[in-house]
């Protein structure tokens, strides 16, 4: 057994003092003799215990016995106990009694010889066993009075050795965490959630975390279980930036070609077909209409220009049907409609004129005439002295169903060189100049192009009733679009209902919003809900083909013939079919190129494509001159060309 | 461009005959009329007529029939205004202006001064 | 003949203050109304012609409106380089007449 230093002491203490307890009980002895028996003096006291500091702790006491019990030939047996007690200093017990082992005499002093747990010189004093080495206790040491006790913090429990703490394993018990995943932990446990939920240990449960209350978003915010969404001003110009919580800018990733020709008078700005140009011409001499420019289009279909008076006197309307030049010509109130010539909307520069002979008039292309048509009378008409001439381009200044044979007048073409009347008049040229929308893109492929600040929209019909299923309503959406987008994001096309809800929408998109992943993607929705998605590389300056198919039971999404991958369970297209289905059967917009002002959270993407596009949707081409409405700055049938990097 | 220049200034007496030129440039001269127009100093502007550069027939104001003439030298794209027998009364400024129904381009005056 | 009254004959404004002149023709003339100005010992220089259309290079403090018989030309923010006569000139019937004029002065 090993003994800790201050107990090895106390033990051999009383061993050292054998002897010297031999030597006190003769010297009680001589005492009786000398000093009870007889009065003694300090030198007889001195003999007998043969030592000053004994005598001098004994004298002075045994004189208060006397005084207090009488000499001793008075024989008071008081007075002997009180001389006979005086040598032991252990009598009356000086040491403490509940700390002390044994009370030890010495020469006129005593030693207390303490139980463990005690010390002091009385043994009175508690010793604290935690001081060194924590009491030997792993976790925690509670000294008490005269003793220490081992104890463990919450979690552990104490080993039977009485020192070591062990773990507690609180995830045996299921009530735990009630809802939540139990985590063993030393000394501890957590109660722990997915991610976007947080533990409440009142309701023993998961609940969700709202994101949108810590301010997350710096625009639109939606809640959602275990997570959140940031949504963007799309139609702003702003989509969400790679932390998925701000935003930025939807900038080209594609440059085109977007330089103006100042020289050039664009048809196609006036959706309204209302003209771009009207000229008042005013003469006191005759004259004859002469009119030469320049022209270029991709259009099959429109207006050039009209000459002439009042709707019901004398006027003509050079236009294009078809691709070919077509003269509309009333003179006197009788119409005639002459079509001839080459197909023109082939998008390269060619000469027009039409002149107007004694009886004759003449149109060429390229200087060779492709019609000769003989007129009676004259274009000016004379009133009050002066001969008029009303001209307009790019348009008519009466309504279509006045024509001799209605016609589309939108025309998306381009004129230059312009020569009207032998004019030297500049002021076309001053207006043009001032106005970039009035010029032309220098250059211009087929396609319709999109700016990125508008939209087209079509009254279009996605359902029908077949006659041989009876009443059955059937349904269908197929959209082919042929892409070369100049940004990463932005609506190809939507359907919207009259409550601005999106029952379909294709769009490009520059995240995954669930991965929350940057990634060029396609993605085909139902209002809000992703349907499919389906890479692509948007800015690579390649013509890309979207192909969307939606009827009963099926929904696909595919980019350059590759198929998209589903993001919905089987059970959750059923229901957004049925939505979208719903949808159909009432009043629904279609919308090309943006949507109009619904909410941020309507649909995946609300931004304005740029790019170009053109657009199939089951098996019809849009044209855009078709529309119920286009913005303005959408060229219907003309896209300017990548901007290729020179070396 | 377009420019109309005129003949210079004249003094002349009364009962005398002046004619003035206007020489147009920048423009097919026979497919505009050509006007011309009066302006007594300190006084307004009166159109006086026009002349037809392709035929060459003249028309006048009522008040300016019978001492006035309108002519032409086509070759020379020139339009020429002649006053006869001269009064006090037409001392004024003489413009000639292109036809367009209304007058863009002008020339920059002749002073014409009838004083005994 | 149409004839065209204008008014005031003259007047004298302040720079930056606007400027109205009115002609009234005796017969209706739609639109057919033009607006010159003319400064000393130069020819009259149009600024707007028929169909209250503001002539190319023109500045944009000149304007004009009317139809039928009533025409209002306006300089909005007179400048000092618009002190000259101003005429009105109808083109809607031969004989073509001018108003007598206007003489814009400073004060």
């Known amino acids: 057994v090993l003994l800790r230093a201050r107990e090895a002491a106390q033990f051999l203490r009383p061993r050292q003092r054998r002897a010297y307890q031999v030597f006190e009980e003769a010297k009680q002895g001589h005492l009786e003799r000398e000093c009870v028996e007889e009065v003694c003096s300090k030198e007889e006291a001195r003999e007998v215990f043969e030592n000053d500091p004994e005598t001098e702790y004994f004298y002075p006491r045994y004189q208060e016995c006397m005084r207090k019990y009488g000499r001793p030939e008075e024989k008071n047996p008081d007075f002997a106990k009180c001389v006979q007690n005086l040598p032991d200093q252990c009598t009356p017990n000086p040491c403490d009694k509940k700390g002390t082992h044994i009370c030890q005499d010495l020469m006129g002093n005593f030693f207390c010889v303490c139980t463990d747990g005690w010390g002091g010189r009385l043994c009175d004093k508690d010793v604290n066993e935690c001081v060194q080495k924590n009491g030997g206790c792993s976790q925690v040491c509670h000294n008490k009075p005269g003793s220490f006790q081992c104890a463990c913090h919450s979690g552990f429990s104490l080993a039977s050795d009485g020192q070591t703490c062990q773990d507690i394993d609180e995830c045996t018990d299921s009530d735990t965490c009630g809802d939540a995943r139990c985590k063993n932990l030393p000394g501890s446990y957590s109660c722990l959630c997915d991610e976007g939920y947080t533990y409440s240990s009142k309701e023993k449960t998961c609940q969700d975390v709202d994101e949108c209350q810590q301010d997350r978003c710096e625009q639109t915010c939606v809640n959602s279980p275990g997570s959140y969404t940031c949504h963007c001003d799309g139609r702003g110009g702003l989509k969400l930036s790679p932390d998925m919580d701000t935003c930025e800018d939807i900038l080209p990733c594609v440059p085109f070609s977007m330089a103006k020709s100042v020289k050039s008078l664009y048809l196609g700005r006036m959706f309204s077909g209302t003209p771009v140009i009207r000229l008042r011409f005013k003469r006191l001499q005759p004259t004859r209409l002469l009119a030469e420019f320049d022209f270029r289009t991709f259009d099959p279909e429109g207006v050039l220009f009209f000459a002439g008076g009042r709707s019901d006197s004398t006027w003509i309307v050079l236009g294009l049907r078809a691709g070919r030049l077509e003269l509309q010509l009333r003179y006197n109130g009788v119409g005639r409609i002459t079509s001839s010539g080459p197909t023109i909307n082939h998008g390269m520069w060619q000469t027009i004129s039409v002149e107007e002979l004694e009886r004759n008039l003449v149109i060429k292309v390229n200087k060779d005439a492709v019609m000769k048509i003989a007129v009676a009378g004259e274009l000016f008409q004379l009133e009050r002295g002066l001969y008029h001439l009303n001209l307009t381009v790019g348009g008519i200044p009466f309504k279509e169903s006045e024509l001799v044979q209605p016609i589309n007048p939108r025309l998306d073409g381009c004129m230059r060189s312009w020569n009207w009347l032998n004019g030297e008049d500049s002021a076309i040229q001053e207006t043009v100049k001032a106005n970039t929308k009035m010029q032309c893109f220098s250059v211009t492929e087929r396609g319709s192009f999109f700016p990125g600040n508008g939209f087209a929209t079509y009254r279009l019909n996605y359902t029908r009733t077949s006659l041989d299923v009876g009443t059955e309503t059937t349904w269908e959406v197929k959209v082919v679009a042929r892409i070369r987008p100049a940004t990463d994001t932005g609506v190809l096309l939507a359907l919207v209902g009259d409550d601005d809800v999106v029952p379909i929408s294709v769009a490009l998109v520059d995240y995954h919003s669930t991965k929350k992943l940057k990634k060029q993607l396609v993605v085909l929705a139902v209002e809000d809900v992703a349907l499919a998605l389906m890479e692509i590389k948007v800015c690579d300056s390649q013509e890309h083909t979207v192909t969307v198919s939606l009827r009963e039971g099926e929904a696909t999404l595919e980019v350059d013939g590759t198929k998209g991958q589903s993001e919905v369970s089987t059970a959750q297209l059923q229901e957004r079919l049925d939505t979208l289905k719903t949808h159909l059967q009432g009043s629904v917009h279609t919308y090309v190129g943006g949507l109009p002002e619904v909410s941020v959270i309507s649909a995946p993407v609300t931004a304005f494509y740029r790019g170009c596009m053109t657009l199939e949707v089951n098996g019809k081409i849009l044209d855009l001159d078709t529309a119920s409405y286009k913005h303005s700055d959408i060229t219907s049938h003309s896209c300017p060309p990548v901007e290729h990097a020179t070396p | 461009q377009i420019q109309l220049v005129q003949s210079g200034p004249e003094l002349k007496k009364p009962g005398e005959t002046v004619k003035i030129s206007c020489r147009a440039s920048g423009y097919t001269f026979t497919n505009y009329g050509m006007n011309w127009v009066k302006q007594a100093p300190g006084k307004g502007l009166k159109w006086m007529g026009w002349i037809n550069t392709n035929t060459g027939e003249p028309t006048y104001t009522e008040e300016f029939k019978g001492r006035f003439a309108f002519s032409l030298e086509t070759s020379a794209t020139t339009a020429y205004l002649q006053i006869n027998d001269l009064k006090n009364e037409d001392t004024a400024t003489y413009f000639c202006?292109?036809?367009?129904?209304?007058?863009?381009?002008w020339g920059q005056g002749t002073l014409i001064t009838v004083s005994a | 003949e149409t004839t065209v009254t204008q008014s005031p004959a003259s007047l004298s404004v302040a720079t930056g203050e606007k400027v109205t002149i009115r002609c009234i023709t005796s017969?209706?003339?739609?639109?057919?109304m033009n607006w010159y100005q003319q400064k000393p010992g130069e020819p009259p220089k149009l600024l707007i012609s028929e169909g209250n259309t503001l002539r190319p290079g023109v500045p944009s403090r000149f304007s004009s409106s009317g139809y039928g018989t009533d025409f209002v030309f306006t300089i909005e923010n007179t400048l000092s380089e618009d002190v000259a006569d101003y005429y009105c000139l109808q083109t809607d019937s031969v004989p073509l007449t001018f108003g007598a004029g206007t003489k814009l002065e400073l004060k």
């Open positions: 017969t209706d003339i739609d639109d057919d």
């Open positions: 202006a292109r036809d367009e129904g209304w007058f863009v381009y």
